[in-house]
C-alpha cells in the first residue's frame, strides 16, 4: 500500500503519500476552527508508470498506453485512496461545537 | 457532471473528460482481443482550481491551500469518476470467449 509506512521511509518519485501539515489560519486563512490549530492532511503526488498501484483496468490500460506512446498526454494520476476524518472544535457565538469532518486526512494513494 | 455531454461541447482547460480512442493492436500491442478492434476509452485531464468538481473534503481543502499557496506542489488531480465495462471477444485456441472487462471506459471525471 502506498501509505506512510511505505512512502515516508522510501525515497519515491512515483506516486506516493507525501507529508503535508496544514495550519488552518496560516495556510487556509481559516479562523473559525478553534482546535486543532492545524493537522497532518498529507497529499498524493508522483508519477504513475506502468502498473504502479493502478486501481482500475482503465488505469492499467492507460499506463501501458502511456509506456508504449510516451509522447501521449494521457496518463493515470496519483490521488488519494483511503481517507480519515478529523475532529474539530469550533464556536457558534459562545457555544462550543464538536464536529467530525469526513475525508480530511489522506492515509494512502493510488494511480487512477 | 464532467462528462461527455459537458466536456465534449466546451473548450475546457480545467479537469474534464477527454476523448481517447485506443486501437488494441496499434496502441497497446495487443493481438489477443479479436473484437472490438479498439474502443473509446477516454481519459481525464486538466487543472483542478479552487472547488472545481472536488469530490472530498480533503480535495476541497487542498484546492484552497493551493490557491492561497500557489508555489506549493500539493494540488488535487483530475481522475476518473464513473467507469463502464467493455465486452470483448477473444479466443482460447479455437474456442471463442466473450468477457466483460470492468472499468474500461471513463464516463466522467472529478478532482480528487
Amino acid at each position: 500500500a502506498l501509505d506512510a509506512a511505505y512512502c515516508f521511509r522510501n525515497v519515491q518519485d512515483n506516486c506516493c503519500l507525501r507529508p503535508l501539515y496544514i495550519d488552518f489560519k496560516r495556510d487556509l486563512g481559516w479562523k473559525w476552527i478553534h482546535e486543532p490549530k492545524g493537522y497532518n492532511a498529507n497529499f498524493c503526488a508522483g508519477a504513475c508508470p506502468y502498473l504502479w498501484s493502478s486501481d482500475t483496468q482503465h488505469s492499467r490500460v492507460l499506463s501501458l498506453y502511456n509506456t508504449i506512446n510516451p509522447e501521449a498526454s494521457a496518463s493515470p494520476c496519483c490521488v488519494s485512496q483511503d481517507l480519515e476524518p478529523l475532529t474539530i472544535l469550533y464556536y457558534i457565538g459562545k457555544t462550543p461545537k464538536i464536529e467530525q469532518l469526513s475525508n480530511m486526512i489522506v492515509k494512502s494513494c493510488k494511480c487512477s | 457532471a464532467l462528462d461527455a455531454a459537458y466536456c465534449f461541447r466546451n473548450v475546457q482547460d480545467n479537469c474534464c473528460l477527454r476523448p481517447l480512442y485506443i486501437d488494441f493492436k496499434r496502441d497497446l500491442g495487443w493481438k489477443w482481443i479479436h473484437e472490438p478492434k479498439g474502443y473509446n476509452a477516454n481519459f481525464c485531464a486538466g487543472a483542478c482550481p479552487y472547488l472545481w468538481s472536488s469530490d472530498t473534503q480533503h480535495s476541497r481543502v487542498l484546492s484552497l491551500y493551493n490557491t492561497i499557496n500557489p508555489e506549493a506542489s500539493a494540488s488535487p488531480c483530475c481522475v476518473s469518476q464513473d467507469l463502464e465495462p467493455l465486452t470483448i471477444l477473444y479466443y482460447i485456441g479455437k474456442t471463442p470467449k466473450i468477457e466483460q472487462l470492468s472499468n474500461m471506459i471513463v464516463k466522467s471525471c472529478k478532482c480528487s
Epitope: - | 497497446l28 500491442g29 489477443w32
Partner: nanobody, 114 residues
C-alpha cells in the same frame, strides 16, 4: 493456480552477461503482456522491459541496446538477455504478467560486482 517463477540470476562481473527466465503457469500466457521489473536496495521498483502478445517491446532508457526481452509462447516463458552488465544493474528482478489482472513473481537477485 497462477505461478511466475524466475531463474537465471546470480553474481557476475561488470561487462558480463546473464539470461533471466520466467516460466508461467495458470494464465493464458500467449495473451499476456509480459514484463521485467527491478528493484535495487532503497530504490523504487522500475520497469526494465516489456513485450506484448503482439511482440511490441519497450525498454527503460538505462538498458536500451544492452538488454533484450523475448518470449516463447510454446514454452510459456519470457526471457531477459542482459549484456554489458553494470554495477547499477544490481537489483532483484521481478517477472510480471498482465492479462485482465497483474501478476508478479517472487524475484531473482542479480549482483554485478568485481
Amino acid at each position: 493456480q497462477l505461478q511466475l517463477v524466475e531463474s537465471g540470476g546470480g553474481l557476475v562481473q561488470p561487462g558480463e552477461s546473464l539470461r533471466l527466465s520466467c516460466a508461467a503457469s495458470g494464465i493464458i500466457f500467449s495473451a499476456s503482456t509480459m514484463a521485467w521489473f527491478r528493484q535495487a536496495p532503497g530504490k523504487q521498483r522500475e520497469l526494465v522491459a516489456l513485450i506484448t502478445d503482439g511482440d511490441r517491446t519497450n525498454y527503460a532508457d538505462s538498458v536500451k541496446g544492452r538488454f533484450t526481452i523475448s518470449r516463447d509462447n510454446a514454452e510459456n516463458t519470457v526471457y531477459l538477455q542482459m549484456t554489458e552488465l553494470k554495477f547499477e544493474d544490481t537489483a532483484v528482478y521481478y517477472c510480471n504478467a498482465f492479462w485482465l489482472k497483474a501478476y508478479w513473481g517472487q524475484g531473482t537477485q542479480v549482483t554485478v560486482s568485481s
